[in-house]
Interface confidence: low
């Protein structure tokens, strides 16, 4: 295509001159006339049009073709568009006395749309007013050849596709050219044909590669603040789809009752700083963008913004720190149209405390620094939860205060293994902070191959963790699996608009607070013969360390009045202790936790509990009465015995039945057993008779028995 | 030579309404925090309410605070009390003071003071 | 608020005493005090400013010291036109609150 115009991204003029005229106007760039350039060669600036006659009609022509250039050499055919009318070329011989004394020119503007999507072109008149009264058509013809290396110098006739352009305005017409993005590095070639009145003027071949002359959109969200030191800070962001780093102009005023002052910066980050702002003054600004790496063109102006500075300026405005740190308020102050010497500045907190004189800087002139030191929590006052930090002059304070949140950061973070070592839980609580509206907290965390450090940090590479709310207030997060060796070293940081604040660091190894399973097949049992109450239990599987146990014990009831025993024997899974009722039944509970003392208790196991029983023979018989009757004279009387249940204390722990064991001179010993009955009835016929009670369990019969012997004589007892 | 001069003291019924002035002369008035300060009879001082040169800003002791108003004009050289609801403990002499500069509510010149008498 | 308490309350003394009156502070106020001297049927007159600061025109015999939450004013040679109530003023703190006195009589 080197017969082609290459179009550059800035506005060019095309000239269309009547046949055997001079070309004295051929499109340059826009402001240099034909023979200027700049220093390395090339045009930049579009000339203006120029006229011999600006009141000529084409009343007098009929489908004449003028040839058009964009090029200053005379004695040079222009390239050909293949399309062009019955494939005439762009001379024709016109007889008009008239068209031998002008040119037409236009001023053309391509570029490809910031969406990527649309090559556009305008084609402004230069005739201004001239076509208004013929009708007047514009065309582009173009065509993306698929293949440019077998493809003719010229696409041939018919390749070329039309757009109508759309001439709103007479003098300005829109050409858009929709370009697939797969073409946008590819080489598009088009012409122009404006047809008015029948006459028609058709240009050279153009070539441009879109990607070259994309025309970004205005950069996006332009805003102004003032830094933490003092400046001003322009920022925007840059347009959605550009596939290049921009450049940017940005051009602002600012206007005080003092200064104007403007100014313009190229700059290829997406902000600026301005320094030496001043109270009380507006800035104006507006922002372009353009390819940074490439040819390009100016995007259009973002709409104006203004930022106005108040009369006094807080730097910055609002501090968000935490207890027992150091921070820093600086301040100008404006009254009055004058700026107030800094050294007649004066500090005052919540309009209530004035903040001594030790605490100023003079930063300079006309700024003044107050620093607070080893702050306290801010206690809110009301709805407010920070304090008012006022800059005043000698006579008054402004009613513009700077905001200062001083927050105990100072959040507990306690950690707990599960028994099965798969997963680590921690638990934090906000309860012990401040509350600070539209602040997020998040558990943050790091961890490390192996153990904790001597001094836990916070590591710069850290991960957030995901924590719910619990019914009790605390928050619950929970880390899953777990490297039992490695050290997690956590905090709470607190997000916020004016800055995030970190907890102290907390280091936890999840080995070191496992809590363990409980104890499990926990038995208890009074011993029998010995009397003790014996408890037994298996150590969980998890975890291998030796561990202590804990047991408790007592009368099982409503509520158990627990005594406590400890096992420091790791090896240990009985325990046989002694018990003042053998014959209760006790409940037992056992829980363990590592011996060397790290971690938790486990929970206690489920109670086990004793189940009365026989221990030993009953320690006596009981004690019984007699009552006798029948005649004092006769020697044959009915005797009844009687006696009382023996307690458990005694029987140890049950009695089945009573033996009554008689003794006589005459008929010697037998036994009698009478059950479970506690009255028994013989009959007394001899001179000495002894019976002895006896109370009988499932171990045998009790020892320890009383006697009672009947004689000769012996009255009736009641 | 700096001077201050109250009016506008007088007996008043509880509930009432008062309006106390204060002349000053002998200093630029507009540069300088002007207060008002009570004292009930036989007892201390009490710090009413200051307001600074401009008369932008204004501040009040909690036991007035919505019922009374300090204002001023510097144009006529002259601090005003508007006394609202008044109650028997608000009765006492009233000095307006001037300040010494600073914003510090320290009072380096005193009116001679005007009596307000609250009572049924 | 700052509660400020004088002592004493009552004080009697002869010319060429010399005097010396407490002031305390419920908290610390650093060096923001002042003290005034009042007499009888007069407005106030502010004699010492930032603890130890003598206001213009007042005579050197008054002196003020202390700083945090105790101050201390002294007349080194009482005279006669010093009879009068003096007041502690705090100013650092919102309401600048005021001592309840110290009158001075003769003995």
């Known amino acids: 295509f080197n017969l082609s115009y290459p179009i550059t991204p800035w506005r060019f003029k095309l000239s269309c001159m009547p046949p055997n005229s001079t070309y004295d106007y051929f499109l340059l760039p826009a402001g240099l006339s034909k023979n200027t350039s700049n220093s390395n060669g090339h045009y930049e600036t579009a000339v203006e049009p120029k006229f011999n006659s600006s009141g000529t009609h084409f009343s007098n022509l009929s489908k004449t073709t003028f040839h058009c250039c964009f090029r200053s050499e005379q004695d040079r055919n222009c390239s050909l568009c293949a399309d062009n009318i019955e494939g005439k070329t762009f001379v024709s011989t016109v007889n008009s006395l008239v068209f031998q004394q002008i040119d037409a020119n236009w001023n053309i503007q391509c570029w490809l749309k910031g969406d990527l999507k649309l090559f556009i072109c305008y084609v402004e008149s230069l005739f201004k007013n001239l076509f208004r009264n013929y009708n007047y058509k514009v065309h582009l013809l173009y065509v993306l050849p698929e293949v440019l290396e077998d493809s003719p110098l010229v696409p041939q006739k018919g390749s070329f596709q039309m757009v109508h352009c759309n001439c709103s305005v007479h003098e300005c017409c829109e050409c858009l050219v929709p370009v697939p993005t797969a073409k946008l590095n590819d080489t598009l070639l088009m012409c122009l044909k404006i047809t008015s009145g029948g006459v028609i003027f058709q240009s050279p071949l153009m070539s441009v590669q879109p990607i070259n002359m994309v025309k970004p959109d205005p950069p996006l969200g332009l805003h102004m603040e003032i830094t933490d030191d003092g400046n001003l800070k322009i920022s925007w962001s840059s347009p959605p789809l550009v596939p290049f780093p921009l450049q940017y102009q940005v051009k602002y005023s600012e206007n005080s009752t003092t200064v104007i002052r403007e100014a313009d910066k190229i700059v290829s980050a997406t902000s600026l700083l301005v320094d030496s702002i001043l109270p009380g003054s507006s800035y104006e600004v507006q922002v372009r963008g353009k390819r940074l790496d490439g040819p390009g063109i100016w995007s259009d102006w973002s709409t104006p913004r203004v930022f106005t500075t108040q009369d006094v300026i807080y730097f910055p405005p609002k501090i968000l720190t935490s207890v027992g740190s150091n921070v820093s308020f600086h301040c100008i102050y404006k009254k009055e149209n004058k700026i107030v010497p800094s050294k007649e500045i004066v500090w005052w907190m919540n309009l209530a405390e004035k903040i001594p004189q030790s605490q100023y800087d003079v930063v300079s002139d006309h700024v003044s620094k107050v620093t607070f030191f080893n702050l306290n929590e801010t206690k809110p006052r009301g709805k407010f939860t920070y304090d008012a930090v006022y800059c005043c002059n000698e006579h008054e304070c402004h009613h513009r205060y700077a905001e200062l949140y001083v927050i105990d950061v100072n959040i507990n973070i306690s950690c707990e293994t599960d028994g099965y070592l798969t997963k680590m839980t921690c638990r934090w609580s906000t309860s012990t902070i401040q509350s600070l509206a539209e602040s997020t907290l998040q558990l943050r965390y790091h961890r490390s191959s192996l153990y904790c450090s001597d001094i836990p940090s916070i590591h710069p590479i850290s991960e957030p963790k995901d924590c719910y709310l619990q019914s009790d207030g605390f928050y619950e997060c929970i880390f899953q699996p777990i490297f039992l060796l490695s050290g997690y070293t956590m905090w709470i940081r607190i997000n916020h608009s004016l800055g995030s604040l970190d907890s102290p660091p907390t280091c936890v190894l999840p080995d070191s607070v496992v809590k363990p399973l409980p104890p499990s097949s926990v038995k208890a049992e009074i011993t029998i013969n010995i009397g003790l109450l014996k408890i037994s239990w298996e150590k969980p599987v998890f975890p291998e360390n030796n561990l202590q146990f804990q047991i408790r014990y007592g009368l099982s009831g409503k509520e158990v009045q627990w005594k406590m025993y400890e096992v420091y024997d790791a090896k240990s899974k009985s325990v046989s202790l002694p018990v003042p009722d053998l014959c209760a039944v006790y409940a037992v509970q056992v829980r363990c936790k590592r011996l060397d003392g790290l971690g938790y208790w486990s929970n206690w196991s489920n109670p086990a509990y004793t189940v009365v029983m026989d221990i030993k023979v009953p320690m006596r018989g009981p004690e019984f009465w007699r009552i006798i009757n029948g005649d004092t004279m006769k020697k044959e009387k009915n005797v009844t015995l009687l006696w009382k249940p023996l307690m458990k204390n005694d029987s140890l722990c049950s009695v089945q039945r009573y033996v009554i064991n008689h003794h006589t001179s005459c008929n010697g010993t037998w036994s009698e057993d009478v059950g479970n009955h506690t009255k028994f009835t013989f009959l007394w016929t001899e001179q000495a008779h002894t019976v002895t009670v006896l109370a009988i369990n499932s171990i045998g019969a009790s020892v320890a028995n009383f006697n009672l012997t009947f004689s000769w004589p012996m009255s009736k007892v009641n | 030579e700096v001077q201050l001069l109250e009016s506008g003291g007088g007996l008043v019924q509880p509930g009432g309404s008062l309006r106390l002035s204060c002349a000053a002369s002998?200093?630029?008035?507009?540069?300088?925090?002007m207060s008002w300060v009570r004292q009930a009879p036989g007892k201390g001082l009490e710090w009413v309410s200051a307001i600074s040169g401009s008369g932008g800003s204004t501040y009040s002791a909690d036991s007035v605070r919505g019922r009374f108003t300090i204002s001023r004009d510097n144009s006529k050289n002259t601090l005003y009390l508007q006394m609202n609801s008044l109650r028997a403990e608000d009765t006492a002499v009233y000095y307006c003071a001037k300040d010494q500069g600073d914003w510090d509510f320290l009072f380096d010149y005193w009116g001679q003071g005007t009596l307000v008498t609250v009572s049924s | 608020d700052i509660q400020m308490t004088q002592s004493p309350s009552f004080l009697s003394a002869s010319v060429g005493d010399r005097v010396t009156i407490t002031c305390r502070a419920s908290q610390g106020i650093s060096s923001s005090l002042a003290w005034y001297q009042q007499k009888p049927g007069k407005a106030p007159k502010l004699l010492i400013y930032?603890?130890?600061t003598l206001q213009s025109g007042v005579p050197s015999r008054f002196s003020g010291s202390g700083s945090g939450t105790e101050f201390t004013l002294t007349i080194s040679s009482l005279q006669p036109e010093d009879f009068a109530t003096y007041y502690c003023?705090?100013?650092?703190?919102?309401?600048?609150?005021f001592g309840q006195g110290t009158k001075v009589e003769i003995k």
């Open positions: 002998g200093f630029t008035f507009s540069s300088f925090a």
């Open positions: 930032t603890a130890s």
């Open positions: 003023q705090q100013l650092n703190y919102y309401p600048f609150s």
